[in-house]
Amino acid sequence: VEVQVSEDPVVALVDTDATLRCSFSPEPGFSLAQLNLIWQLTDTKQLVHSFTEGRDQGSAYSNRTALFPDLLVQGNASLRLQRVRVTDEGSYTCFVSIQDFDSAAVSLQVAAPYSKPSMTLEPNKDLRPGNMVTITCSSYQGYPEAEVFWKDGQGVPLTGNVTTSQMANERGLFDVHSVLRVVLGANGTYSCLVRNPVLQQDAHGSVTITGQPLTF
């Protein structure tokens, strides 16, 4: 028996359902009573779901997994993972045994989009050209860790005096805070771009300082 899975990682958004595809080619006369199917975490061997001797043995993994029972006899051994969490990320091995056996691993990449950044300025009044200001760009609830880019009004990258911190919350999602320290010119626009590297999703925020008042 030959087991086939997708070579590319499966990308799943947090709180959505994901299908880890796995298939095999049943011989003529194949019956589910002959099938041993095991899904397990590749790195720890932890059992995720199994089907043996014609019976779905159920989820051994937080009761969020399911097979496609009507499709098993056709060789579809795919696994449905419900309400995906950050902690589900990793490699899953699909092991199929009939007369002989084979296995293959599929990777699950979890992702969550970042919120539109909020911009804050310190100090935020009595600003004059030549003043040093701190601009903070904050974006929330994304995964995996973001890439953050700063640019000025002419699109020139600002790389000096940037400090970015990313903190995971209890769900494993990241809140990003990036701080730019800059000396004000007469007028200036400062843009922050927060990129999710898996989703290739960009979230933009900017602040324009025109003497007074400030615009965000």
Partner: antibody, heavy 118, light 110 residues
Amino acid sequence: EVQLLESGGDLVQPGGSLRLSCAASGFTFNTYWMNWVRQAPGKGLEWVAGINSKGGVTYYADSVKGRFTISRDNSKNTLYLQMNSLRAEDTAVYYCADWNDYDIMDVWGQGTTVTVSS
Amino acid sequence: QSVLTQPPSASGTPGQTITISCSGSSSNVGRRTVNWYQQLPGTAPKLLIYTNAQRPSGVPDRFSGSKSGTSASLAISGLQSEDEADYYCATWDDSLNAWVFGGGTKLTVL
């Protein structure tokens, strides 16, 4: 030829320590999980510990938890078992065995003898 | 006390068929595939049957394995004197996160 060769077995006093080694050859050691299994004189096989291919995941039998440490050096194709606080009941032949993707221990070493006695 | 239960001994005459049972639970045999090992006196264990019923190359087809529910069994047909050995079943236990072995069955060929 696929081969596992254990070494380091010795006579040691209760409370003492010992480190066993298992040299692997003939297969891609760094892609395999590995195990230690022991057999006390006249008794059956008892699994001791297992480790994943990269060395970051380890499992232990309750009887050795907190006393034994399994580790590996993939650059040397070698598996280790550090045994501390040894007891008389740890006296056994210790085998290393591979643990392939299909959850089979199909290659075993010849064993090394550990005797814990005063 | 082993997690998997095997009869401590079995015997048969040359040419006979004998069966060795291995009883487990839903967290090991019920969910996982079973392997069987043969250990001749004074030697290391040798893989005899893997994935419930598969024979490694070089193992005679007199040896066969099967699994049903939480039990597995090893059958040896056409018993020969060189089959005299200890036989162990083994599998992974998902509750214990441990490999578990049967206590072993000593086969005597009369």
